[in-house]
């Protein structure tokens, strides 16, 4: 079964780890109150303590299944032979209001289980209706969801979920919004939030698109809520660059997709190409993203309020090889303010009757924008026309850091005492620690000040998550979860080494002659007791 926590890391104190030798790990979430860690895997869901001791394991597979069976064999007998089939966890979300974990797998056409947070007891597994089948695609990192809690005391929770469909558009929508009922066995569980003859809370990939481009699909990399919108970062086949000829080379494009949280008819659907560019090199294959607040210094540099959202993203170079992208990659920064402004400008221009809807994969026709006197403000959520809408110009981010050798695979960020720290996972199993400061001398907007090994030689997967107290970072590879301290100040043995490291967490604690965080240093606020600047080392 699963291994015990054990030592890892090099010259630093050993990191706590959790190993799963038998089953590949896929997703990780951390409970923001208890700090407990939930891990999705192939055929398993694990509950771990904050220091990665195993508390519970829940078995989800293998199951007797065949992906050609629709509905699944548990619902209706199937003419296809059944075999022992792995159940890959593809979505793992905490439903705090209902004290449960939502774990969606690949088996039985992609059904979900609700597990009690305390002990992973299975509360329910809706599997009788077509709405219960999200997608049988096995690829773990291709589905993303956002859980929207209902208004306190009333209103229903809902799940926005995006998934690839592997050509089965008659079975699965690529994007949908589903009801989440309090009772796991409720017949309406996972029903579309709205559905009538013409309109519903879903988007299907048209069969025309699949006829022309059989490989067309949308892969959902990251999703988040910001203000009244839900956003997705996606990768999709670029139908403009890819030849319909199946033997031809496939090109991909990254898109940011936006929907209003309270738009059950999906009239607010907008998608824009997204990427960034540095020194003439285009980075267009989104690998991961992380929604954060900027920190006082960065907020000031960007002209933002400290409570505005920013998005850190990792893009690989070019537009080819989605599954094995080029190693060269870039860490980029977007402000949600700029993204919203670009989208609003596009909507306003369309409502002036300018141009087309420009969404070839979804419309298969060049519908013209319709002139309408509507006032389009920041909160506009669409009408039954001028939708769905595609952006024609790429939203470009600010490149912060380029890695030409290792390949960035994952990203997380937080604000430490007004400074913005980004953690980037790499292909070789390392965590790069990066200080973002747009006012850096020499014009370098980010400084990679430390690199630590989480698991040598194994790519860091997307779910890079901070502990609630921001003391640790949980990094996951296919076989291991590693708890990496956000700082290792104690490794620096002199004031010069300590402050020369440029780690924003670290300062020289005079009383004990050690490198530490300010809050770990006695009387740090008294003069000459805590050095936070290299110049102070000389004075001391």
């Amino acid at each position: 079964e699963a291994g015990l926590p054990r030592a890892g890391g090099g010259s630093q104190p050993p990191f706590r780890t959790f190993s799963a030798s038998d089953w590949g790990l896929t997703h990780l979430v951390v409970h923001e109150q208890t700090g407990e860690v939930y891990v999705g895997a192939v055929n398993r869901i694990y509950k771990l303590s904050g220091n990665l001791t195993l508390l519970r394991a829940h078995v989800t597979g293998p199951v007797e299944d065949n992906e050609k069976c629709y509905p699944p064999p548990s619902v209706q007998s199937c003419p296809h032979g059944l075999g022992s089939t792995d159940n890959v966890n593809k979505l793992l979300l905490l439903d705090y209001a209902a004290n449960r974990l939502l774990a969606c797998g690949s088996a039985s056409q992609g059904i979900c289980q609700f597990l009690r947070l305390d002990d992973l007891f299975k509360l329910g597994e809706p599997h009788h209706r077509k709405e219960h089948y999200l997608s049988s695609v096995q690829e773990a990192g291709s589905m993303a969801g956002v859980l929207i809690a209902g208004p306190p005391g009333q209103g229903q929770a809902k799940l926005f979920v995006g998934t690839p469909i592997d050509g089965k558009s008659e079975y699965f929508p690529t994007l949908s919004s589903r009801r989440l009922m309090a009772n796991e066995e409720d017949a309406d569980m996972f029903g579309f939030v709205y559905q009538d003859e013409f309109v519903s809370s879903q988007l299907k990939i048209p069969s025309d698109t699949l006829s022309k481009f059989p490989a067309f699909d949308i892969y959902y990399v990251y999703s988040f809520r910001s203000e009244q919108f839900v956003y997705y970062l996606t990768l999709q086949l670029d139908t403009q660059l890819t030849s319909p000829d199946a033997a031809g080379e496939h090109f991909f494009t990254s898109k940011i997709v936006r929907l209003c949280v309270d738009d059950p008819k999906f009239y607010s659907y907008v998608e824009f190409p997204i990427g960034c560019e540095q020194a003439g090199v285009e980075y267009r294959l989104v690998q991961d993203a992380y929604l954060s607040r900027p920190g006082r210094a960065l907020a000031h540099q960007l002209g933002l309020a400290e409570d505005e959202d920013v998005l850190f993203t990792v893009f690989a170079q070019g537009q080819k090889n989605r599954v094995k992208p080029p190693k060269e990659s870039a860490l980029c920064l977007f402000t949600l303010r700029a993204i919203k402004e670009k989208i609003k400008e596009r909507i306003q221009s369309c409502y002036r009757g300018e141009g087309k809807l420009s969404l070839p994969w979804l419309l298969n026709k060049e519908l013209g924008c319709i002139n309408s006197p509507l006032q389009i403000d920041d909160d506009f959520c669409g009408q039954d026309f001028n939708q769905p809408l595609g952006g024609t110009v790429t939203i470009e981010g600010t490149p912060l850091f380029v890695d030409k050798d290792d390949g960035l695979t994952a990203v997380a960020a937080y604000d430490y005492r007004g400074r913005t720290v980004v953690f980037a996972g790499t292909r070789s199993g390392r965590i790069r620690k990066i200080l973002v400061d747009l006012s850096n001398p020499g014009g370098r907007p980010a400084l990679a000040y430390e690199s630590v090994v989480a698991q040598e030689g194994s790519p860091i997967l997307r779910d890079l998550v901070l502990s609630p107290n921001h003391q640790y970072l949980y990094a996951m590879t296919e076989k291991q979860v590693t708890r990496v301290p956000v700082e290792s100040c104690v490794q620096y043995t002199s004031c010069e080494l300590c402050l020369g490291s440029r780690d924003p967490h670290c300062g020289w604690c005079v009383l004990h002659s050690i490198c530490s965080r300010r809050d770990a240093c006695e009387r740090a606020d008294e003069p000459q007791r805590f050095a936070a600047d290299l110049l102070q080392c000389v004075q001391l």
Partner: antibody, heavy 120, light 108 residues
Framework: QVQLVQSGAEVKKPGASVKVSCKAS????????MHWVRQAPGQGLEWMGI????????SYAQKFQGRVTMTRDTSTSTVYMELSSLRSEDTAVYYC?????????????WGQGTTVTVSS | SYELTQPPSVSVSPGQTASITCSGD??????ASWYQLKPGHSPVLVIY???KRPSGIPERFSGSNSGNTATLTISGTQAMDEADYYC???????????FGGGTKLTVL
Amino acid sequence: QVQLVQSGAEVKKPGASVKVSCKASGYTFTSYYMHWVRQAPGQGLEWMGIINPSGGSTSYAQKFQGRVTMTRDTSTSTVYMELSSLRSEDTAVYYCARAPGHYYYGMDVWGQGTTVTVSS
Amino acid sequence: SYELTQPPSVSVSPGQTASITCSGDKLEDKYASWYQLKPGHSPVLVIYQDSKRPSGIPERFSGSNSGNTATLTISGTQAMDEADYYCRAWDSNTGDVVFGGGTKLTVL
């Protein structure tokens, strides 16, 4: 079930006005637009205009601009179409038809039709 | 103003396939819908958004739209399909909904 029930047949003199009602039931009245379409004897279908029951906004066919008025009463889930300055060529069957959107969708439910005869 | 042109009549033998065309300038850049109208009845929507079929409409009804022509196809035509058929689109210049002149389908 979803139903649109229209008012009865009318006979009018040239120059007069006619007001046809269309009462909706079986669905959320404000969630669907309402079109008005007519068919004159031996002729094809002709679109007259559309009303959004949610806010009351209207859009009329150029041909009927200035002569047609569409209104709604949300308390009774009823829409009205009034056509003024009637002429003999306005003799037709008038239909109300609901649609989930203004431009992109079909008219999926139709009233039974109201015959309006304009004759001196 | 925008115009949609349909053939006045189309004849077909039972069990055969009937095709009714509707032509208009760059019609493929608009959504076409089709309505069936029988004497003494109200119109019935049979196809919307070029090729989508409302629930309750038999699978033998299908639609397509490319170039300047939208087509309603009825495969395995039955006697009950005899009716007038109208195509419909929206004129983005005037804001008007436009109907074709109608096609009388006769099942021989």
